[in-house]
């Protein structure tokens, strides 16, 4: 059986302040069952940006319908980008459990924020 891979195709993305940023992520397998989560940063301060199954993330929307069967596109769109949103974002696959167990992370996409065009 093929090993699960989490693919973040872009190493970096640059967005003007006030615009939306799309962060792309796909998985190569639906197995094992479990959610995708998006984080900014690594280590103790790793910040949860989006959880596929729970939580309230008003500025973040999935690009594809997460309820759709066989969906393997876990890309997200973050609206109204500000300089404070800069950083490296990671798409991470978890195995369902109590608690969920981290399986595989994408390589990360660095988001940089350009000044708003005048």
């Amino acid at each position: 059986e093929e090993e699960l891979q989490v693919i973040q195709p872009e190493k970096s993305v640059s967005v003007a302040a006030g615009e939306s940023a799309t962060l792309n992520c796909t998985a190569t397998s639906l197995i094992p069952v479990g959610p995708i989560q998006w984080f900014r940063g690594v280590g103790p301060g790793r910040e949860l940006i989006y959880h596929q199954k729970e939580g309230h993330f008003p500025r973040v929307t999935p690009v594809s319908d997460p309820t759709k069967r066989n969906n393997m596109d876990f890309s997200i769109r973050i609206s109204n980008i500000t300089p404070a949103d800069a950083g490296t974002y990671y798409c991470v696959k978890f195995r369902k459990g109590s608690p969920d167990v981290e399986l595989k992370s994408g390589a990360g996409t660095e988001l940089s924020v350009r000044a708003k065009p005048s």
Epitope: G45, R46, E47, L48, G55
Partner: antibody, heavy 117, light 108 residues
Amino acid sequence: DVQLVESGGGVVRPGESLRLSCAASGFTFRNYGMSWVRQAPGEGLEWVSASSGSGSTYYADSVKGRFTISRDNSKNTLYLQMNSLRAEDTAIYYCAKVTWNNFFDYWGLGTLVTVSS
Amino acid sequence: EIVLAQSPDTLSVSPGERATLTCRASQDVAGKLAWYQQKPGQAPRLLIHATSSRADGIPARFSGSGSGTEFTLTITGLQSEDFAVYYCQQHYDWSPLTFGGGTKVEIK
């Protein structure tokens, strides 16, 4: 406004246990890393432990195996269970919010732990 | 473990003057260095992160610079409320996160 309020400090004997709590408000607690940093009397700052937004835990070598960090996201509370306490654990223990880039942007006022026979 | 050495231990400065504090790392921290201020009986307060980015609400008289292993916190036009202990912290390697030993800025 972000607020962090520690409690649970006190005086204990060597070998005893204590549990510290940190009540957080003013931000979405479950999304962020939280940490404990201590300061022995008249000394500098020492990082003790952290819990990431995904629940991963991290410890300084000096407390590994004796201290356990945990969090209750439903109660917006961070904990530090301290077992087998030693005289050198005597310090003010600060609860701090950790940014995505691993520095500390908000701190509580601290709670004093004294380990003495 | 990345070790941070701060110098001097104590700095005596007159109000209105400039204070220059140094933090040296035992290895390259890729610019991930923060500075905190701590007054007696108070919790630390974040001043600077990522070498030179001021935290919210921090006055412009506080500035950070440096690269590689050597970093500087400069306070221009010292005010009475700036007399305190200052700590650096590297946020490059989290195993473990480490602080410098501190520099006390006192009134001359």
